[in-house]
């Protein structure tokens, strides 16, 4: 048994006569043999679920669900209740109605075995019938909505009449009917005004019925029509077995470059026309089990269940359904030497499904784990300026497909054949598994015998110690020119173009800082600034070379304070700035200020 609504509303007036009928509550059957029996909770409740008083005023007919006044609610009774309402004015009280034999504790009132009946209290007597508007004669203030379980026996779930109005204003004639399309499963009995289902409903065919209730009021010669929505929602039960959309029960996957723990290797989708169990229960009752295979597979893979509500078209309307994505996920990082092929089976069980048929599906994943060979191009040829400053980035090395790698830890190293010409360093970038080549020793750059630098680049997979080698040939170009006196260590200090381009700074490949002219559009990522190389700084990312010294690119790497209009970077640096941004790394400060447009003019005049 279950209530067709979770809440009912009616009005209560002072001194309403004992015996006044108030409303009917309705229960629908889950099985044909069930007989409803109603009982009221013992207490009246007020604002914020405050227990006000034992219910001495309202009774229920256990077999029909009719609520009526057992005794008149006078002023003094009302005062008594108001005092207990924590100081709030008492506008609404409610009762709990239970369906026997459901032995719910009084404290809990959850649909389907309990409904709340709210009474709006009016501190006046029942108004004169002639003063009631048609809307008040026809329907309660709060519009009802109904919930009916699918596949259940048909039954009565509503009674249109406002009983107090019918009881106190017998001379006003009120008629009701339902506006509904052809073939809908509802009827309104003309005599009793009871609304019932004609047959069992199927949610998978239609989930919502947006009906309209029409009320016609006859008072003397006057006739008025009132229409209100009459929505019915069909509640789901687990009556559909899971299926494979388009019959696809097998997914094939290749694990190659993406070998990181938590990588989704393959996904299979299961469709279920039902939307139960509800989300809180779903993963517990809709189970997936990776069937025992070899131990390696059990340790290496896991299955993740990702249910999602979807909607499908049925008989011209949309109804909700569930798609379950079963993802085969790597449980650990896979070594690059791992090489095997296997078939994994996953058992999916809709444990609430009662049939006919089975609520069980078998998912198949065909997985090939390919080994990864480390390869470098045979030779790298690069050039570097003799004027390059320490930490200048001059190039990248990268094993084949390194951009696609994840879960593969490759470290790069340079082997130098000559101590006096060992100019370069390499650091491994975590982002793309590449190695960034940078100037580490500027003194070596200036030695005449170091016109060509020969290195071996060695890439090593940290897990297996497998290696790839390539030769690196670096040509040293240009001639060395000593820097002007008084230049700062960091390009970022310079606030104007002229002073910027006169100096070099840490990280500068040419030995000169570069000016980046911003777009002048408020707080922008493209702010004006002085940089060792606009290719790498600022780019919103403090790379692995820039982390080595805060003077290289404080615009990307500073953790200190930024003064002026800006948007801070995540987790550090300046994401966007206003005008020109310059920094003082030693003081851990950057300043973003409006462009100084007089600057070029002044320079011309001073000349």
């Amino acid at each position: 048994l279950y209530f067709s609504r979770d809440a009912y509303w009616e009005k209560l007036y002072v001194d309403q006569a004992a015996g006044t009928p108030l409303l009917y509550v309705h229960a629908l059957r889950d099985a044909p043999e069930e007989v409803p029996s109603f009982r009221l909770g013992q207490h009246l409740y007020g604002t914020y679920r405050t227990r006000l008083h034992e219910n001495n005023w309202i009774c229920i007919q256990e077999d029909t669900g009719l609520l009526y006044l057992n005794r008149s609610l006078d002023h003094s009774s009302w005062e008594k209740l108001s005092v207990r309402n924590r100081g709030f004015p008492l506008l609404t009280v409610y009762l709990k109605v239970f369906l026997s034999p459901t032995s719910l504790r009084e404290g809990e009132c959850q649909w389907p075995g309990c409904a709340r009946v709210y009474f709006s209290f009016f501190n006046t007597s029942f108004p004169a019938c002639s003063s009631l508007k048609p809307r008040e004669l026809c329907f309660p203030e709060t519009r009802p909505s109904f919930r009916i379980r699918e596949n259940r026996p048909p039954g009565t779930f509503h009674q249109f009449r406002l009983l107090p109005v019918q009881f106190l204003c017998p001379n006003i004639s009120v008629a009701y009917r339902l506006l509904e399309g052809e073939g809908l499963p509802f009827r309104c009995a003309p005599d009793s005004l009871e609304v019932s289902t004609r047959w069992a409903l199927d949610r998978e065919q239609r989930e919502k019925y947006e009906l309209v209730a029409v009320c016609t009021v006859h008072a003397g010669a006057r006739e008025e029509v009132v229409m209100v929505p009459f929505p019915v929602t069909v509640y789901d039960e687990d009556d559909s077995a899971p299926t494979f959309p388009a019959g696809v029960d097998t997914a094939s996957a290749v694990v190659e470059f993406k070998r990181k723990e938590d990588t989704v290797v393959a996904t299979l989708r299961v469709f279920d026309a039902d939307v139960v169990p509800a989300s809180g229960e779903l993963v517990r009752r809709y189970t997936s089990t990776l069937l025992p295979g070899d131990t390696w597979a059990q340790q290496t893979f896991r299955v993740e269940h990702w249910p999602n509500e979807t909607s499908v078209q049925a008989n011209g309307s949309f109804v909700r359904a569930t798609v379950h994505d079963y993802r085969l996920v790597l449980n650990r990082n896979l070594s690059i030497s791992e090489n095997r092929t296997m078939q994994l089976a996953v058992l999916v069980n809709d444990s609430d499904f009662q049939g006919p048929g089975a609520g069980v599906l078998l998912l198949h994943f065909n997985v090939s784990v390919l080994p990864v060979s480390l390869h470098l191009p045979s030779t790298y040829s690069l050039s570097v300026s003799r004027r390059a400053r320490r930490f200048a980035q001059i190039g990248k090395v990268c094993v084949e497909n390194c951009q696609a790698f994840s879960g593969i830890n490759v470290q790069y190293k340079l082997h130098s054949s000559g101590a006096n010409c060992s100019t370069l360093g390499v650091v491994t970038s975590a982002e793309d598994t590449s190695g960034i080549l940078f100037v580490n020793d500027t003194k070596a750059l200036r030695r005449p015998k170091c016109a060509e630098l020969h290195y071996m680049v060695v890439a090593t997979d940290q897990q297996t110690s497998r290696q790839a080698q390539a030769q690196l040939l670096v040509t040293v170009e240009g001639s060395y020119v000593a820097e002007e006196a008084g230049c700062p260590l960091s390009c970022a200090v310079s606030k104007r173009r002229l002073e910027c381009e006169e100096c070099g700074g840490l990280g500068s490949p040419t030995g000169r800082c570069e000016w980046r002219q911003g777009d002048g559009k408020g707080i922008t990522r493209n702010f004006s600034t002085c940089s060792p190389s606009t290719k790498t700084c600022p780019d919103g990312h403090c790379d692995v070379v820039e982390t080595q010294d805060i003077n290289i690119c404080p615009q990307d790497c500073l953790r200190g304070s930024i003064v002026g209009g800006h948007e801070p970077g995540e987790p550090r640096g300046i994401k966007a700035g206003y005008g020109t941004c310059n920094c003082f790394p030693e003081e851990e400060k950057c300043f973003c200020e409006p462009e100084d447009i007089q600057d070029p003019l002044c320079d011309e005049l001073c000349r």
Epitope: T379, H415, A419, K449, L473
Partner: antibody, heavy 118, light 107 residues
């Protein structure tokens, strides 16, 4: 002037390990350059085998990678070659050589003949 | 690996003559080729590197030329001590590889 001298057993049994020593005089192996092993097969074909740099970094010919190892003893100014699981195909004259900055072999030892035979 | 084909494998000449030995690489190695001399009872000697740069202490009658894939060692006005085994070696691509050698003998 820098001089290199190879030493080790002239005869090794198949499946055993071949161990050679290169003793360097006139130059410290930790101060500069790469120090190499090269071998010459009976038909005169030369094959570069491995290096160890002044800083201790090692590199190996991929064709030998699984069975070769180069180490050094800085206190004795020596570097060593170990080649495991030898076969008769490893019969050759083994040379140690010093590289230049460009990996070219500027100085060579006299060479030592190693025969692999049962 | 870069294959180095050296020719001829055998050469007979008389003192005072000029001879050439050729090396061809299976792919471009730019200028990164070295030439060595091997004589019995002596240590191998680096003659030329970077295709054409004479190693210090090597007589000027030895010269090298070429780049890319084709290289030549020229010995002008042969001296008696020049009769030996000669090898070329590429050192731009790992692993470094040698030519098969040329035996220069007195005619």
């Amino acid at each position: 002037d820098v001089q290199l001298q190879e030493s080790g057993p002239g005869l090794v049994k198949p499946s055993q390990s071949l161990s050679l020593t290169c003793t360097v005089t006139g130059f410290s192996i930790t101060s500069d350059y790469a120090w190499n092993w090269i071998r010459q097969f009976p038909g005169n074909k030369l094959e570069w085998m491995a290096y160890i740099t002044y800083s201790g970094d090692t590199g190996y010919n991929p064709s030998l990678k699984s069975r070769i190892s180069v180490t050094r003893d800085t206190s004795k100014n020596q570097f060593f070659l170990q080649l495991s699981s030898v076969t008769t195909e490893d019969t050759a004259t083994y040379y140690c050589a010093r590289g230049n900055y460009d990996w070219v072999f500027a100085y060579w030892g006299q060479g030592t003949l190693v025969t692999v035979s049962a | 690996d870069v294959q180095i084909t050296q020719s001829p494998s055998y050469l007979a000449a008389s003192p005072g003559e000029t001879i050439t030995i050729n090396c061809r690489a299976s792919k471009s190695i730019s200028k990164y080729l070295a030439w060595y001399q091997e004589k019995p009872g002596k240590t191998n000697k680096l003659l030329i590197y970077s295709g054409s740069t004479l190693q210090s202490g090597i007589p000027s009658r030895f010269s090298g030329s070429g780049s890319g894939t084709d290289f030549t060692l020229t010995i002008s006005s042969l001296e008696p001590e020049d009769f030996a085994m000669y090898y070329c070696q590429q050192y731009i691509e790992y692993p470094w590889t040698f030519g098969g050698g040329t035996k220069l003998e007195i005619k």
